[in-house]
Interface confidence: low
């Protein structure tokens, strides 16, 4: 027979040789990191075919390493389900734990035993110090110092000083998250007052007001011979300015010289602050103009944000 | 480390005023939040007031209308006004370091004694 | 403003007795409480906060428990050193506050 064969859990007692006669036997040992339990053959023969009698290491098992329990407020789940040295063992937190520690324990062989690569890790519960103060304004559970996960407090703006209010730009309300981070930047409390929209051969149909503060939306129409450069819904944003820019209403060309353009509300790179001008006359669109009176709005003489002042 | 002394302690009448200083050293004063607290026989340990690092401050409200704490950065001080004392503000006064953001008191200086007395 | 009531307000236990110390809050305070030594002629020194957690430096024979609005410090073998007065102090709501003291002495 040639070399004996070779396993990965159990190794030849002795040097092999290059060649060995009918009927001489070789025995093995298991290798280090594993032991022997009965009643598995760990030898074999070279027969008169010669080929080795059948032998396997099943009778070799791996080193394990010792049971390590669950953290408090976690999971211990070792890779492949066996404690074995060569395999890892994996740490997981709860919701509202963090790790402090290793998140991955590796059973490694120490001379003949099988131990951890290091100790255990804990799971921390998740706390939060005060959310940031901000300027002219406070939050919910100010007087709270420490915040646990998922905490949540609201911000509002504190009454402003002079004729206009404070307005929350941001999220109102953040959490205590992972990390021990606080779920998003905190919003900021500031007066924001866009000025009067003004569209000169257009009108004003919602929106009415005397003053026009954060997220003010207004819409407008254009007069009769002229279409809509940009958008018919302009916002108050956190900078005073409208959002998208106050659009203008430009005169329709005769359908004999060119064609009107597509209502495409693009945004124009100059504005105009001019009071409106009465609509000139001139030949009708060749699209359908918006509608003038829309339903439900109310007619400009009713101004509807008069009685927020 | 930062070290935090306190001074201005003595004896005054009761009407008077008087301004605690809280001294940091190995440490900006404005880099932490600073607690006044006040211990006498009789009435124990009492919290009067906080200033956090962005410059506001908390006050215990029964002491709100009489004591002001503010900050001096360019003397990397913490100060105490006290008003209208009486006599039963007489206590060993501390200024204490907030523990990193949290309201557990680990740091305190020895004191600075106030008595009101006529 | 929460009033923490602290009991008993005095005791004498001998060197190496368990020594049991509670606080009550007028208030649910969950578990922000944490308890003070001041040793005769000192400033008082933080041990345990957040109700359980001990300050470096302070010996594992303190200990700290309790949730709500009842808590309590043990120390499982009083020492000599450990004399002074005891204090508890909440801080989930301004103004923070500290119990009355209790007075620890040995026999």
């Known amino acids: 027979c040639e070399e004996p064969p070779t396993f990965e859990a159990m190794e030849l007692i002795g040097k092999p040789k290059p060649y060995y006669e009918i009927g001489e036997r070789v025995d093995y040992k298991c290798k280090k990191g594993y032991f022997y339990i009965p009643p598995l053959a760990t030898h074999t023969i070279c027969d008169r075919n010669h080929t080795w009698l059948p032998v396997s290491d099943d009778a070799c098992y791996r080193e394990t390493c010792p049971y390590i329990r669950d953290p408090l407020n976690g999971q211990a789940v070792p890779a492949n389900g066996t404690y074995e040295f060569g395999y890892q063992m994996h740490f997981i937190c709860n919701e509202g734990y963090y790790l402090i520690g290793e998140e991955i324990l590796y059973c490694e062989l120490k001379g003949s035993v099988a131990i951890w690569s290091g100790k255990p890790p804990i799971c921390e519960k998740v706390l939060c110090t005060p959310p940031p103060k901000i300027k002219n304004g406070k939050h919910t559970f100010s007087e709270v110092e420490v915040f646990e996960y998922l905490d949540a407090v609201t911000y509002s703006c504190d009454p402003a000083p002079g004729p206009d209010p404070f307005s929350l730009i941001g999220e109102s309300t953040i959490y205590c998250g992972d990390n021990s981070v606080w779920s998003r930047a905190a919003p900021e409390c500031k007066v924001v007052k866009c000025r009067f929209p003004v569209v000169e051969n257009g009108k004003q149909i919602s929106g009415f007001g005397k003053k026009f503060y954060y997220k003010a939306t207004v819409m407008f129409e254009c007069d009769k011979g002229f279409y809509l450069d940009g958008s018919d819904t302009i916002v108050c944003d956190s900078n005073s300015t409208w959002d998208p820019p106050v659009p203008k209403c430009l005169k329709v060309l005769p359908p004999s010289s060119t064609k009107p353009p597509a209502l495409s509300h693009s945004v124009s790179t100059s504005s105009t602050t001019k009071s409106p001008a009465s609509s000139a006359s001139g030949p009708r669109p060749t699209y359908k103009p918006p509608v003038s009176n829309y339903p439900g709005y109310p007619k400009p003489e009713e101004g509807i944000l008069d009685s927020l002042d | 480390e930062v070290q935090l002394v306190e001074s201005g302690g003595g004896l005054v009448q009761p009407g008077g005023s008087l301004r605690l200083s809280c001294a940091a050293s190995?440490?900006?004063?404005?880099?932490?939040?600073i607690s006044w607290i006040r211990q006498s026989p009789s009435r124990g340990l009492e919290w009067l007031g906080v200033i956090w690092t962005d410059g506001g401050t908390n006050y215990n409200s029964a002491f709100m209308s009489r004591f002001t704490i503010s900050r001096d950065d360019s003397k990397n001080t913490a100060y105490l006004q006290m008003n209208s004392l009486k006599t039963e503000d007489t206590a060993v006064y501390y200024c204490?370091?907030?523990?990193?953001?949290?309201?557990?008191?680990?740091?305190w200086g020895q004191g600075t004694l106030v008595t009101v007395s006529s | 403003a929460i009033q923490l009531t602290q009991s008993p307000s005095s005791l004498s236990a001998s060197v190496g007795d368990r020594v049991t110390i509670t606080c009550r809050a007028s208030q649910w305070i969950s578990n922000y409480l944490n308890w003070y030594l001041q040793k005769p002629g000192q400033s008082p020194q933080l041990l345990i906060y957040?109700?359980?957690s001990l300050h470096s430096g302070v010996p594992d024979r303190f200990s700290g428990s309790g949730s709500g609005t009842d808590f309590t410090l043990k120390i499982s073998r009083v020492e000599a050193e450990d004399v002074g007065v005891y204090y508890c102090?909440?801080?989930?709501?301004?103004?923070?506050?500290f119990g009355q003291g209790t007075k620890v002495e040995i026999k």
């Open positions: 102090q909440q801080y989930i709501k301004l103004p923070w506050t």
């Open positions: 204490e370091r907030v523990y990193d953001g949290y309201p557990w008191f680990a740091y």
């Open positions: 957040y109700t359980s």
């Open positions: 190995g440490g900006s004063v404005s880099s932490y939040d």
